[in-house]
């Protein structure tokens, strides 16, 4: 925030001796010193720390106040830590006092201490030790005080040392007015300060070229009586296609863009995009590259991925496992997924049609994030072609040919499906007659059925099997009054089907010659 300072005194600007008044003469001493940038300057130092009750005064020359009402005094000084001075803890101080005296003219070399008005006691934010001193860490304190309103033509400043070890490195006296500035891309003109100390003058700013006011937030500032611009409210921002450079808005260069006034800077066009004029608010995609609808303007234009690589398969009867490697080129995107297209092909013409909905895919057919899939429930002894396509967020925007990896296979003979409808036809003391239905999918010629049975309380520790070619069988030599578990599976050249669900049957008690049908106790799926 720029403030116009009208300098009335700047000790650092003076190359010759300052020749201020020191009283007593053995107190403040004018020496050549160095400022924080090691530039030679005139400084005053005092270090009368051995004796108590010090009262060393230093007075500036008479300062004409010009048009000022309120005066600012900036002091830069170093103060040595009393702990770094041996044996002076009782007498050493770490503050000094600042005074002023108003007068219409230079009153000469005599300091009349009683006429001076105290401004403040000045303490260091940072004092330094002997060790710091050695490293030339001259910890420069800056203190600003104000005086006024002043009524006379000028004044003196005076510094009273009461026993500190100080060097006054710089004394600057000035007044301020609000000067024309550009703030938040708005121009605020020179403004006369308010007459009262507390008054603030509100000034409305005008946006610089190619800037616009932020929505419902027009730029305003307040000029204080201290000559400072305060409380910026609102701002201007560079329009789309323009960026801030210092206090102006400049157009984005070629190959750069800015999509919104809310963005701070122009950005280089993302990869595979371009802008061929200045002041662009967006970049166009190169041929063959696209932006997905959800892609923000700052992301690179991308393209569909190449085909998956190294597609391999494994056939297990009517199940096919496919596995592949990611595409060599993901198109510049991280949202690559895979989709599987299954086609069943005829033996003769080689014509292929989509497989239909009765095929199973594990984990899924589309949106696959992993690079493997299992295709189940295929027909036995059938020809299939599987196309594995990598897709990303811009695949559907591309009109170019699909890229995929394909493999053609022939399924083997499948094992039969599960036997169903197992029924108890007759139950005796030592025999049970069962019947069942052929599997829904025999997947070939059923050569026989295998019946597995065991006493329920044996829990399949020992079981017996019986084979039959028909869909019924009588199981003999059973124990009377015993619960048996029965399961049946079909057998083809391709192998064994899954066992049917368990069927519990209780044979009749030996004492009773009565015939009745035992009831099923439970029924559950039991794998092969």
């Amino acid at each position: 925030q720029a403030a116009k300072e009208v300098l009335l005194l700047d000790s650092k600007a003076q190359q010759t001796e300052l020749e201020w008044i020191s009283s007593p003469p053995s107190g403040w001493e004018e020496i050549s010193g160095l400022d924080e940038n090691y530039t030679p300057i005139r400084t005053y130092q005092v270090c009368q720390v051995m004796e108590p009750n010090q009262n060393n005064w230093l007075r500036t020359n008479w300062i004409s106040k010009g048009n000022a009402q309120r005066i600012f005094v900036e002091l830069k000084f170093t103060l040595r830590d009393c702990n770094s001075l041996p044996g002076v803890l009782g007498t050493c101080k770490e503050t000094f006092n600042l005074y002023y005296y108003e007068t219409d003219y230079d009153t000469g070399r005599n300091i009349r201490e009683n006429l001076y008005v105290k401004i403040d006691t000045i303490a260091a934010d940072e004092s330094f030790t002997q060790g710091d001193l050695g490293e030339r860490k001259m910890k420069l304190n800056t203190e600003v005080r104000e005086i006024g309103p002043l009524s006379k033509k000028g004044f003196y400043l005076a510094f009273q040392d009461v026993g500190a070890c100080i060097a006054l490195v710089s004394v600057k006296v000035y007044y301020k007015k609000c000067w024309s500035i550009v703030e938040n891309l708005a121009v605020f003109p020179d403004t006369v300060t308010g007459s009262e100390f507390s008054s603030l003058v509100e000034v409305r700013g005008t946006c610089v070229s190619s800037a616009e006011e932020e929505a419902e937030n027009s730029p305003r500032m307040h000029c204080s009586a201290e000559g400072e611009w305060l409380v910026p409210i609102g701002k201007c921002i560079c329009k789309a296609g323009y960026q801030q450079k210092g206090d102006t808005c400049e157009p984005c260069g070629r190959r750069f863009y800015k999509s919104s006034s809310q963005d701070l800077q122009c950005s280089r066009c993302p990869t595979h995009s371009f802008s061929d004029r200045e002041g662009s608010s967006r970049c166009e995609c190169e041929d063959g590259y696209y932006r997905a609808p959800s892609d923000p303007p700052y992301v690179a234009c991308t393209r569909p991925p190449s085909a998956p690589q190294n597609l391999i398969f494994n056939i297990n009867q009517t199940t096919v496992s496919l596995e592949w490697s990611p595409p060599a080129d993901n198109g510049g995107r991280n949202d690559v997924t895979y989709r599987i297209l299954c086609k069943r092909c005829s033996w003769e013409q080689g014509e292929c049609v989509p497989c239909g909905s009765n095929i199973g895919y594990m984990p899924q057919q589309t949106g696959l994030e992993d690079n493997y899939v299992t295709v189940m429930d295929l027909l036995a002894h059938a020809n299939y072609t599987f196309e594995v396509e990598a897709v990303n967020g811009v695949s559907d925007l591309s009109r170019s040919q699909r890229l995929f990896a394909a493999v053609s296979i022939t399924t083997g003979q499948a094992a039969p499906s599960q036997v169903s409808g197992v029924m108890k036809e007759r139950v005796l003391q030592r025999s049970v007659q069962l019947s069942w239905q052929e599997p829904e999918h025999p997947n070939g010629v059923i050569t026989e059925y295998e019946i597995k049975y065991y006493e329920k309380d044996q829990r399949e520790r020992t079981y017996s099997t019986l084979k039959t070619k028909s869909t019924s069988a009588s199981i003999n030599n059973l124990k009377p009054g015993t619960v048996y578990v029965f399961q049946i599976r079909a057998v083809t050249a391709a192998g064994y089907g899954n066992y049917s669900p368990r069927l519990d049957v209780a044979t009749l008690e030996e004492a009773s010659g009565k015939m009745f049908e035992a009831t099923a106790v439970s029924s559950e799926q039991n794998p092969v």
Epitope: S26, C47, L79, R80, P86, Q130, E135, R136
Partner: antibody, heavy 121, light 106 residues
Framework: QVQLLQSGAEVKKPGASVKVPCKAS????????MSWVRQAPGQGLEWMGW????????TYAQGFTGRFVFSLDTSVSTAYLQISSLKAEDTAVYYC??????????????WGQGTLVTVSS | EIVLTQSPATLSVSPGERATLSCRAS??????LAWYQQKPGQAPRLLIY???TRPTGIPDRFSASGSGTDFTLTISRVEPEDFAVYYC????????FGQGTKVEIK
């Protein structure tokens, strides 16, 4: 003009004592500390210690405790160095020097002309 | 205690030449170092304090630098009255002098 005035040469026998005065003028005596420095014939400078002229509190360097005593008489702006049980190796020029503390560093800015103390049997 | 070692012990220069004297401390003394000049039969004279600050009245041909353990006193153009012994002195909790460097006419 700031000055430190020391007494003339002293010749002493071993075991004797000597008191070397250092009279200050041209400044407020109690506003600056006073240091003592020894220089044996043909040798370098050796700092013996210093005394706070305001409080009278002395500080002695290593090797200068016991036989060496710093004292003051502020009424006549004079600092004293007393050496007891003199030995031949105490033969040297003894300087008083005003200590200057400043913001930028410390040093001995005003020196007396020195007092030669000769210890000989 | 901190030991100060000055080098060289003797430096032979012609008037108008540059003289560079070195002082090394056995441990860091920050910049708590002063330089003194002593002519035969005279008391020492303070040349530099705070490692690099010149008191009023010391000619600007004398300059000094350094901090920590390594310090240098430079006489840019040696005048006839500069032939003397120069001592460095550190002022930490206890003060010590270096053994001195004699600057003599070449």
């Amino acid at each position: 003009q700031v000055q430190l005035l020391q007494s003339g040469a002293e010749v002493k026998k071993p075991g004797a004592s000597v008191k070397v005065p250092c009279k200050a003028s041209g400044y407020t005596f109690t506003s600056r500390a006073m240091s003592w420095v020894r220089q044996a014939p043909g040798q370098g400078l050796e700092w013996m210690g210093w005394i706070n002229t305001n409080t009278g509190n002395p500080t002695y360097a290593q090797g200068f405790t016991g036989r060496f005593v710093f004292s003051l008489d502020t009424s006549v702006s004079t600092a004293y160095l007393q050496i007891s049980s003199l030995k031949a190796e105490d033969t040297a020029v003894y300087y008083c020097a005003r200590v200057r503390f400043t913001v930028y560093g410390d040093g001995m800015d005003v020196w007396g002309q020195g007092t030669l103390v000769t210890v000989s049997s | 205690e901190i030991v100060l070692t000055q080098s060289p012990a003797t430096l032979s220069v012609s008037p108008g030449e540059r003289a560079t004297l070195s002082c090394r401390a056995s441990q860091s003394v920050s910049s708590n170092l002063a330089w003194y000049q002593q002519k035969p039969g005279q008391a020492p004279r303070l040349l530099i304090y705070g490692a690099s600050t010149r008191p009023t009245g010391i000619p600007d041909r004398f300059s000094a630098s350094g901090s920590g353990t390594d310090f240098t006193l430079t006489i840019s153009r040696v005048e006839p009255e500069d032939f003397a012994v120069y001592y460095c002195q550190q002022y930490g909790p206890s003060w010590t002098f270096g053994q001195g460097t004699k600057v003599e006419i070449k």
